[in-house]
């Protein structure tokens, strides 16, 4: 039945701070949900590459009502770094859920979105246990880089002011030997 | 915000039909399960069957096989639930319950009806 | 599969109550419980879901646990009120069906 095909919702939950500080490890878990039928592909993205190493999936998506036999589905995987990995705020991690849906053709008249074959994402950036976040992180790159203008800045003014001062102290020797 | 309004009060006779309506409303209809609970005065909550708005398909719990059907009309909102051969027994407050999904580990209701008395007398 | 839960529980006001919820088969590891309050003439109200979590605006009062050894589900409700006071019912579900406990009457003194 065509009207019943929903796309996934995926979410990223972020590792636990007690798991952190007991393992030395971090995992984050990925969890598509609502989904029918259960053509689904999930992968995990770090840094723009897709990552296979520390990943377990669910072997199959699992009725979310299991009394149903049109119910719609759930799959959730796990994807476990070293907990400096996953607090450097540079790192960035991406569960994508390509879902197979309905086709272009495929006709559709229900009052919501057509449900077509997509890749549907969720994202997490690495956070350091001393409050740091991507957006901090990224502050203070900023801010770093400002400071670092103004002082090649300031340095610039002050060479081209010594430079002047010596070119004019050279040209008034000149002017006084001859 | 999400609401489920029932229909009103019915007084049937043994051996006769009812049918009890859950209008859904602030949601997606298609997107949210609906149970269907029932509660005998005096007594706990027992659970009758579910229904998938958007397939259709539904499931009952074994003591009301055969004589449950549960219906949804995806145009109004609304799903149905219809008790025949109905006995003295079966006097009781019926309750829709919707519950959106989302895990495969919970199965709940999220929202309740306000509840249909149903009375059976001769 | 069955829900067992005690008839009834008593408790001052202030006090601390549990309600314990016996599964007879499965486990609330995978099939997880969900707790409804139910006051004299009402709906019934989610307080827990998927064993431990409030619903948004259920106060912090009430909170579920788990315990696997005895595969049984609680209730605690702590700084009792007399608006506690209510049905309580846990319920589960399996392959084929959904299930609720009898339920159990907190009386606060």
């Known amino acids: 039945d065509l009207k019943n095909v929903f796309p996934p919702k995926v979410a990223v939950f972020e590792p636990s701070e007690a798991e952190i500080s007991h393992t030395q490890k971090a995992t984050l878990v990925c969890l598509a949900t609502g989904f029918y039928p259960d053509h689904v592909e999930l992968s995990w993205w770090v840094n723009g590459k897709e990552v296979h190493s520390g990943v377990s999936t669910d072997p199959q998506p699992l009725k979310e009502q299991p009394a149903l036999n049109d119910s719609r589905y759930c799959l959730s995987s796990r994807l476990r770094v070293s907990a400096t990995f996953w607090q450097n705020p540079r790192n960035h991690f991406r569960c994508q859920v390509q879902f197979y849906g309905l086709s272009e053709n495929d006709e559709w008249t229900q009052d919501r979105a057509k449900p077509v074959t997509q890749i549907v994402s969720a994202e997490a950036w690495g956070r350091a246990d001393c409050g740091f976040t991507s957006e901090s992180y990224q502050q203070g790159v900023l801010s770093a880089t400002i400071l670092y203008e103004i002082l090649l800045g300031k340095a610039t003014l002050y060479a081209v002011l010594v430079s002047a001062l010596v070119l004019m102290a050279m040209v008034k020797r000149k002017d006084s030997r001859g | 915000q999400m609401q489920l309004v029932q229909s009103g009060a019915e007084v049937k006779k043994p051996g006769a039909s009812v049918k009890v309506s859950c209008k859904a409303s602030?949601?997606?209809?298609?997107?949210?399960?609906m149970h269907w609970v029932r509660q005998a005065p005096g007594q706990g909550l027992e659970w009758m069957g579910i229904i998938n708005p958007s397939g259709g398909s539904t499931s009952y719990a074994q003591k009301f096989q055969g004589r449950v059907t549960m219906t949804r009309d995806t145009s109004t909102s609304t799903v149905y639930m219809e008790l025949s051969r109905l006995r003295s027994d079966d006097t009781a407050v019926y309750y829709c319950a919707s519950n959106r999904g989302g895990s495969y580990k919970s199965v709940g209701m999220d929202v309740w009806g306000q509840g249909t008395t149903v009375t059976v007398s001769s | 599969f069955m829900l067992t839960q005690p008839q009834s529980v008593s408790e001052s006001p202030g006090k601390t109550v549990t309600i314990s919820c016996t599964r007879s088969?499965?486990?609330?590891?995978?099939?997880?419980v969900q707790w409804y309050q139910q006051r004299p003439g009402s709906s019934p109200t989610t307080v827990i879901y998927?064993?431990?979590?409030?619903p948004s605006g259920v106060p912090d009062r009430f909170s579920g646990s788990i315990d696997s050894s005895s595969n049984s589900a609680t209730l605690t409700i702590s700084g009792l009120k007399t608006e506690d006071e209510a049905d309580y019912y846990c319920?589960?579900?399996?392959?084929?069906?959904?299930?609720f406990g009898g339920g159990t009457q907190l009386t606060v003194l």
């Open positions: 088969s499965g486990n609330f590891a995978s099939k997880y």
């Open positions: 602030g949601y997606t209809f298609a997107s949210y399960y």
């Open positions: 319920q589960s579900y399996d392959e084929v069906s959904v299930v």
């Open positions: 998927e064993n431990y979590q409030r």
